[in-house]
């Protein structure tokens, strides 16, 4: 177990702070909650706290959630490839390009890391060449989110890990918009941190909202687990 | 569980002693034949605020006794699209506040119990 791995084995509390722009709309969004390592859960809420969020709330999961990776269900034949909770508690630098299918992107960049007991994760985002009748700042995305697999090999130059995957969200149409995500994470550290083979995440996520919560808001509930590298033969034979 | 007549009442109860660590939210799910399990209800325990499925609001009401750690389910005016499996389940987490919890997904919860049959006839 890496010492960073020790810190996830009960309910951790989730802290999500992002400060957005996206063709001149400012805006920013808080988000709270608990997530769960053993079970690869997670649970939050978020709230625009400036009034009415400029994009749809399905574009801003993967910056929200997809990002406190750490939170992933590592299988323990799997746990020497868990980057994420082996860079905590200083934590990990996440960097993402979103590229939305004939429209804008959106830059990312994030700092993940525990402040006392709470895994934060600070956000900044940049969006840019977006249409203004597209499906993203026309709102004219479906409120749901699709199953997806998160990518991840390591990038021995910078000790951390790049990442990719192809997200689809469904329009009101019945087409998809498809993001494709560039990511790369970087240790905050200089401790040791796990450089894994290649695998991926396995994710599922579900949009609700609250019926109590005025404010425009999403509730979030995710599952992921971490998969693609088998046991080896030595394994198999114990 | 039981078989009850449309427009009767019947009350699940379900003990959660033997979790392992205490749990966050509490709900009960159904499962009918040949349909996916889905949320019925759930409770937070720490806040008592409880969230309901479209399909059995007004109807159904669910509760916990945290002294004797068992969570309960009220289901009056039953009608027979209410004929399932019903199971208890808990999450370590924070209960998932929705709008209309059959939506939220059999993922959130970590614990479940082994099920009780409830048949009700027109």
């Known amino acids: 177990m890496s010492k960073g791995e020790e810190l996830f084995t009960g309910v951790v509390p989730i802290l999500v702070e992002l400060d957005g722009d996206v063709n001149g709309h400012k805006f920013s969004v808080s988000g709270e909650g608990e997530g769960d390592a053993t079970y690869g859960k997670l649970t939050l809420k978020f709230i625009c706290t400036t009034g009415k969020l400029p994009v749809p709330w399905p574009t801003l999961v993967t910056t929200f959630s997809y990002g406190v990776q750490c939170f992933s269900r590592y299988p323990d034949h799997m746990k020497q490839h868990d980057f994420f909770k082996s860079a905590m508690p200083e934590g990990y630098v996440q960097e993402r390009t979103i590229f939305f299918k004939d429209d804008g992107n959106y830059k990312t960049r994030a700092e993940v890391k525990f402040e006392g007991d709470t895994l934060v994760n600070r956000i900044e985002l940049k969006g840019i060449d977006f249409k203004e009748d597209g499906n993203i700042l026309g709102h004219k995305l479906e409120y749901n989110y699709n199953s997806h697999n998160v990518y991840i090999m390591a990038d021995k130059q910078k000790n951390g890990i790049k990442v990719n995957f192809k997200i689809r969200h469904n329009i009101e149409d019945g087409s998809v918009q498809l993001a494709d995500h560039y990511q790369q994470n970087t240790p905050i550290g200089d401790g040791p941190v796990l450089l894994p083979d290649n695998h991926y995440l396995s994710t599922q996520s579900a949009l609700s909202k609250d019926p109590n919560e005025k404010r425009d808001h999403m509730v979030l509930l995710e599952f992921v687990t971490a998969a693609g590298i088998t046991h080896g033969m030595d394994e198999l034979y114990k | 569980g039981g078989s009850v007549q449309a427009g009767g009442s019947l009350r699940l109860s379900c003990s959660a002693s033997?979790?392992?660590?205490?749990?966050?939210?509490m709900a009960w799910f159904r499962q009918a034949p040949g349909k996916e399990r889905e949320g019925v209800a759930e409770?937070?325990?720490?806040?008592?605020?409880?969230y309901y499925a479209d399909s059995v609001k007004g109807r159904f009401t669910i509760s916990q006794d945290n002294a004797k750690n068992t969570l309960y389910l009220q289901m009056n005016s039953l009608k027979p699209e209410d004929t399932a499996i019903y199971y208890c389940?808990?999450?370590?987490?924070?209960?998932?506040?929705?709008?209309?919890?059959?939506?939220?997904?059999?993922?959130?919860?970590?614990?479940w119990g082994k099920g009780t049959q409830v048949t009700v006839s027109s």
């Open positions: 389940a808990a999450s370590r987490l924070r209960c998932t506040p929705a709008a209309d919890f059959s939506r939220i997904p059999a993922y959130a919860m970590d614990y």
């Open positions: 033997g979790f392992a660590s205490s749990p966050g939210c």
């Open positions: 409770i937070a325990t720490r806040s008592g605020s409880a």
